[in-house]
Interface confidence: low
């Protein structure tokens, strides 16, 4: 066997003591050794593992004048703010030439009031809706028993008898406070107090009651709000843009919503100033003194088409012999829907009015029958959508065409001589 493996006397003349205390305690462990010759560096072990970043100081005192005389070496390990991770068995380690020496162990223990690893957090919950709260504490000493309190009233007869780490609350109808007490052999620690704010439940059954081209009437069913009456509900509408793709529960639409407040009851609201024939998405939330409910999902709705708000513009009507030329331009006023076409009405003095559907053309040539002797012939034009006819233009008299007057280029149309479209008095 190699030389130097025989048991030699330990150089340690002072071993680490024991420290037991509560969290946050500051303490010092101390090793002392006496060696001959150059003093070694002292390393500290915790549970056999070398402490790489130990807060240690080493003091070396020569006992003689010669370097080869004995030295006293003192190493002190400082533990600041004692934590659970600091607990364990501590030893000093030195290398002296051919030997490794380890001191007798000292022990660091933690013992005090319970320490919270997790405490109940403030939160909001909907009225009458179940939720859970968490609380976790540890010693030492163990065991640690928990006691939950609601509005300062214990929820069990004794610590450890009720719910422990997780408290299930089946629902609240008023804003309440919760805390937990942690009990061990050293005493009691109380957690922070969590405030659980009771908000109204999300409204249900948001639906359309009636539709107009520029307004929608909507209604909903309010959710429970506990002991707090609802003060108002807020409705938001946003243009869907026919492909914006707001899905159920998707966060927020891309543009600023139109927001309206409704006094409640009734749980109904007329949304005005909307665009006709336009898809929207709407949602609603209701508010009590404690705060607002969550929003409902976005509901897709659509305003219906309306009739055009104005007549066609720049109507001209001229006659040249047996032909009448009428042309016009699209209304400047909003169409409130998809333009499907134009209706034309004409009437002579002392003759009944006749209606014609012109379609989407903006001019028509009529083949007049007879000698055209009917006097004071007037023409009116109206635009129409699927919702119906818009306002008629003022009557425009049929004027005789004069040579040199511009005449529109158009397709000649000979209207069929069915009873609806014949002018038998000409």
């Amino acid at each position: 066997a190699p030389r130097g493996t025989q048991a030699e006397e330990s150089p340690f003349v002072g071993n680490p003591g024991n420290i037991t205390g509560a969290r946050g305690l500051t303490g010092t462990l101390r090793c002392q050794l006496q060696v001959q010759g150059e003093p070694p560096e002292v390393h500290w072990l915790r549970d056999g593992q070398i402490l790489e970043l130990a807060d240690s100081t080493q003091t070396q005192v020569p006992l003689g004048e010669d370097e080869q005389d004995d030295w006293i070496v003192v190493s002190q390990l400082r533990i600041t703010s004692l934590q659970l991770s600091d607990t364990g068995q501590y030893q000093c380690l030195v290398f002296l030439g051919h030997q490794t020496f380890v001191s007798q162990p000292g022990y660091v223990g933690l013992e005090g009031l319970p320490y919270f690893l997790e405490e109940p957090e403030d939160r909001t919950v909907a009225a009458n809706t179940p939720f859970n709260l968490s609380c976790q504490a540890q010693g030492p000493p163990e065991p640690v028993d928990l006691l939950w309190l609601q509005d300062a009233v214990p929820l069990a007869t004794a610590p450890g008898h009720g719910p422990q780490r997780s408290l299930h609350v089946p629902g609240l109808n008023k804003t309440s406070s919760f805390s937990c007490e942690a009990h061990n052999a050293k005493g009691v620690t109380t957690s922070r107090t969590a405030t659980i704010t009771v908000l109204p439940q999300q409204p249900r059954n948001l639906h359309l009651v009636s539709r107009q081209p520029t307004e929608l009437e909507v209604a909903w069913t309010p959710g429970l709000s506990g002991i707090y009456p609802l003060t108002h509900c807020t409705l938001q509408a946003v243009l869907s843009d026919d492909g914006m793709g707001i899905q159920a529960g998707e966060p927020d639409p891309p543009e600023e919503p139109l927001t309206s407040q409704a006094s409640v009851p009734p749980h109904q609201l007329r949304l005005g100033s909307l665009h006709p024939h336009t898809p929207y998405h709407i949602r609603v939330a209701c508010t009590s003194s404690q705060g607002p409910s969550s929003w409902t999902h976005w509901l897709p709705v659509e305003t219906p088409e309306g009739v055009p708000l104005g007549p066609p513009e720049n109507i001209s009507a001229t006659r040249n012999g047996s032909q009448a030329f009428v042309h016009w331009q699209e209304p400047r006023a909003p169409l409130q829907g998809t333009l499907l076409g134009y209706r034309l009405a004409y009437q002579g003095q002392d003759t009944p009015e006749v209606l014609m559907d012109i379609g989407l053309r903006q001019e028509v040539t009529l083949e007049l029958q007879g000698d055209g002797s009917v006097s004071n012939l007037t023409v009116c034009v109206a635009a129409y959508t699927a919702a119906g006819d818009g306002p008629w233009s003022l009557p425009v008299p049929l004027e005789a065409w004069r040579p040199g007057q511009a005449q529109p280029v158009h397709q000649l149309v000979k209207e069929p001589s069915t009873p609806a479209f014949s002018w038998p008095w000409w």
């Epitope: 330990s10 056999g48 068995q89």
Partner: nanobody, 121 residues
């Protein structure tokens, strides 16, 4: 019984390099302090250095800057890379485990059988 086996020793000229290996029979390398010692003829065994459980290394002043200790946890092996060797580095090199046990109260190491390193001038 845990065994340690050193290898890699031999004859080398001054200024040369050698790499010693220390293989263990159990998975102790990652959790124990592994140390290298050397014993020259007619002398006491001297401490060379150690590698701690977290991978930190500590060297004796006589080898600092020339020797490097490393560890391969997967192979349960510790290495001693020796560069710029000098004739005074001639010795039998031993590796040792400093046990990570709760009853560690004295100088009870587990030793290998050693490997001879000879540095010629």
């Amino acid at each position: 019984q845990v065994k340690l086996e050193e290898s890699g020793g031999g004859l080398v000229q001054a200024g040369g390099s050698l790499r010693l290996s220390c293989a263990t029979s159990t998975r102790t390398v990652s959790s124990a302090v592994m140390a290298w010692f050397r014993q020259a003829p007619e002398k006491e065994r001297d401490f060379v250095g150690f590698i701690s459980n977290s991978g930190s290394v500590y060297y004796d002043d006589s080898v600092k800057g020339r020797f490097t200790i490393s560890r391969d946890n997967a192979q349960n092996t510790v290495y001693l890379q020796m560069n710029s060797l000098k004739p005074e580095d001639t010795a039998v090199y031993y590796c040792a485990i400093i046990w990570r046990t709760s009853d560690l109260t004295g100088r009870f190491n587990t030793w290998g059988q050693g490997t001879q390193v000879t540095v010629s001038s």
